[in-house]
């Protein structure tokens, strides 16, 4: 006999990185017939939704009208069908950005390199932070962490054409409060013809959620996006 229901998916629209004072919607998708959804933040109950009619709804939304550091952190959701509860969703890390200052991103030996060359990014921010984050544009929003008093190094090692793309960095005041993004740095990796033709910018995640983040920073608009649990492995 089943003791729990499958875990729901949780994600943020338009993006899990939210500029301060902008809006974001936390979505939780469970099953049709779920009579109650609960959103939890850092382990505490935050909000409850009882969709009507439950048999026609499998996704609920919780809305944050103006993002701030108190709303940034780890969210999860659960749902109930009858008396049976689901497993909790993966954790959604909701990050507030545009806090305080703007770091500077540079790349060594330069933005145009040959396949096989060793490349290092440097993110510098003079205010009180010791953690830095490097992100490559693309749907995966893969985050690398680096540490240093005012600057962090991000060695990419010998690069391939798969490393091509646009990078930005953030200073982090804590895990969920980040600085303004740096200006972008576009890394161009040239290689032999075979490699170049076979290496799209981000083969795993073609859709651009970074563009969505930028749209949020510039206009604060909401945009409908495909389901994406950024914490899913």
């Amino acid at each position: 006999q089943q003791q729990t229901l499958p875990k729901p998916f949780i994600w943020a629209e338009p993006h899990f990185m939210v500029p301060k004072e902008k809006q974001v919607t936390i979505c939780c998708q469970g099953n049709y017939g779920a009579v109650e959804y609960q959103l939890h933040f850092e382990g505490s109950l935050f909000a409850v939704d009882r969709p009507k009619p439950p048999e026609r709804i499998n996704k609920v939304q919780f809305y944050i009208p103006d993002m701030n550091s108190r709303m940034a952190g780890q969210y999860s959701c659960i749902y109930r069908v009858g008396e049976l509860w689901s497993e909790p969703s993966n954790l959604l890390d909701l990050v507030v950005t545009e806090m305080y200052d703007t770091p500077t991103l540079s790349v060594h030996p330069g933005p145009e390199v040959i396949s096989g060359e060793k490349v290092t990014f440097y993110c510098r921010l003079d205010t009180a932070t010791s953690m830095f984050l490097l992100l490559k544009e693309g749907r995966s929003s893969h985050v690398q962490r680096g540490y240093g008093k005012v600057q962090a190094e991000f060695p990419l090692g010998p690069v391939t054409t798969a490393h091509r793309g646009t990078y930005r960095c953030f200073g982090s005041y804590n895990n969920h409060a980040w600085s303004f993004p740096s200006e972008p740095v576009k890394l161009l990796v040239t290689g032999d013809i075979e490699n170049t033709s076979l290496a799209p910018e981000d083969p795993t995640f073609p859709a651009d959620t970074w563009g969505t983040y930028l749209l949020t920073t510039e206009t604060g608009l909401q945009k409908d996006h495909a389901l994406w649990d950024h914490t899913a492995q």
Epitope: S44, F46, A47, V48, D49, R50, V60, F62, Y63, P65
Partner: nanobody
Framework: QVQLVESGGGLVQAGGSLRLSCAAS????????MGWFRQAPGKEREFVAG????????YYADSVKGRFTISRDNAKNTVGLQMNSLKPEDTAVYYC????????????????????WGQGTQVTVSS
């Protein structure tokens, strides 16, 4: 902007009843999720009961479940809290709060998501 004014507090004996009312100004009242919180001396503010903007969904703290009932009248811009079988531990200042932007069936439990607050009304339950 919504302004909230609570009324109905007072002194009551244990086992008695009180009805709190919260009057809201603002034409968009019907689009706000509403809640009642309380704060006893020397304690943190705690959630008591919440209601979605449609009035279809309610949620209660375990400590008041079965004794308190939250309701709303969107035509009159009011939210009520009927409190029965009162206990001395219910003694506190009771606050009404409004949260904007949620869909019609969402009940907000955390005080972080409530944007507007009343000044509070004192409820004292004597033994």
């Amino acid at each position: 902007q919504v302004q909230l004014v609570e009324s109905g507090g007072g002194l009551v004996q244990a086992g008695g009843s009180l009805r709190l009312s919260c009057a809201a100004s603002g034409r968009t009242f019907s689009s706000y999720a509403m809640g009642w919180f309380r704060q006893a001396p020397g304690k943190e503010r705690e959630f008591v009961a919440g209601i979605s903007w449609s009035g279809d969904s309610t949620y209660y703290a375990d400590s008041v479940k079965g004794r308190f009932t939250i309701s709303r009248d969107n035509a009159k811009n009011t939210v009520g809290l009927q409190m029965n079988s009162l206990k001395p531990e219910d003694t506190a200042v009771y606050y009404c709060a409004a949260a904007s932007g949620q869909v019609q069936t969402v009940v907000v439990v955390t005080d972080r998501w409530y944007h507007y607050w009343g000044q509070g009304t004192q409820v004292t339950v004597s033994s």
